[in-house]
């Protein structure tokens, strides 16, 4: 569910939301580190209906959710890291 994602596209997000998204609507969370043409970290939530939401990395709910996911994955498998670059 949690994915560190490297992309050739510049910043994906223009506006970021702090609005809570319930876990049941979330398919995957992509974390785009700074760099690769974008000066800021971006967090992209893919919803199950294929829409995406750019979430403010400072939003408390997303920080809590990522912490829970990290703990859950560290107790089983490491967080998957996909250095996938879409051509």
């Amino acid at each position: 569910v949690l994915e560190v994602y490297y992309t050739s596209l510049r910043c994906r997000c223009v506006q970021e939301s702090s609005v809570f998204i319930p876990r049941r609507f979330i398919d995957r969370i992509q974390i785009l580190p700074r760099g690769n043409g974008c000066p800021r970290k971006e967090i992209i939530v893919w919803k199950k209906n294929k829409s995406i939401v750019c979430v403010d990395p400072q939003a408390e709910w997303i920080q809590r959710m990522m912490e829970v996911l990290r703990k859950r994955s560290s107790s089983t498998l490491p967080v998957p890291v996909f250095k996938r670059k879409i051509p």
Partner: antibody, heavy 123, light 111 residues
Amino acid sequence: QVQLQESGPGLVKPSETLSLTCTVSGFSLSTFGMGVGWIRQPPGKGLEWIAHIWWDDDRRYNPALKSRVTISKDTSKNQFSLKLSSVTAADTAVYYCARIAGYYGSRDWFAYWGQGTTVTVSS
Amino acid sequence: DIQMTQSPSSLSASVGDRVTITCRASESVDNSGISFMHWYQQKPGKAPKLLIFRASDLESGVPSGFSGSGSRTDFTLTISSLQPEDFATYYCQQSNKDPWTFGQGTKLEIK
């Protein structure tokens, strides 16, 4: 590199079902965020989106064609297919398969295209 | 459905000319600050080729003479100095709402 290749019969009789296949290389149909689809272009006219299918088998159809269209994929063969039933002369067109860029989900765009295959509907 | 209207439908121009093609959507194609409007070039007998995505982002490998601008419902594709290989048909496409829809095309011909 990314490649898409359409195949199928060039001639289909009215009222029959048109079946096309697109074979892809350079990417996997099962990769998260991946979508592929079909677009057609009648002779001398513009482009019309038909349908696309996502990595998780979620399918989206053009409402104008939905009752006659089925899109499917076979990940193991790196292929996806289009079936259009009850065809008429109005379905004569060049049919393109294409790959969605993979950045914005339902709000994405077509980044890569096959070269197209001409389908004529005639008896 | 969102209707896309391109103008002009056809255009005659000379090598070196600056050319602007417009595309108007029947409703806004913006979402979260991004315009989901894209431009393609198609040459006779060939598949369309992506030129511009998100209204103004140049696709990799596309010459810098192409540029896109606009927001909400009104968009333009500009070719700063026409080259012989630029004579083709150009299509806009919106992806903000299903079904994804294309403009009817603008045919750019040699004067």
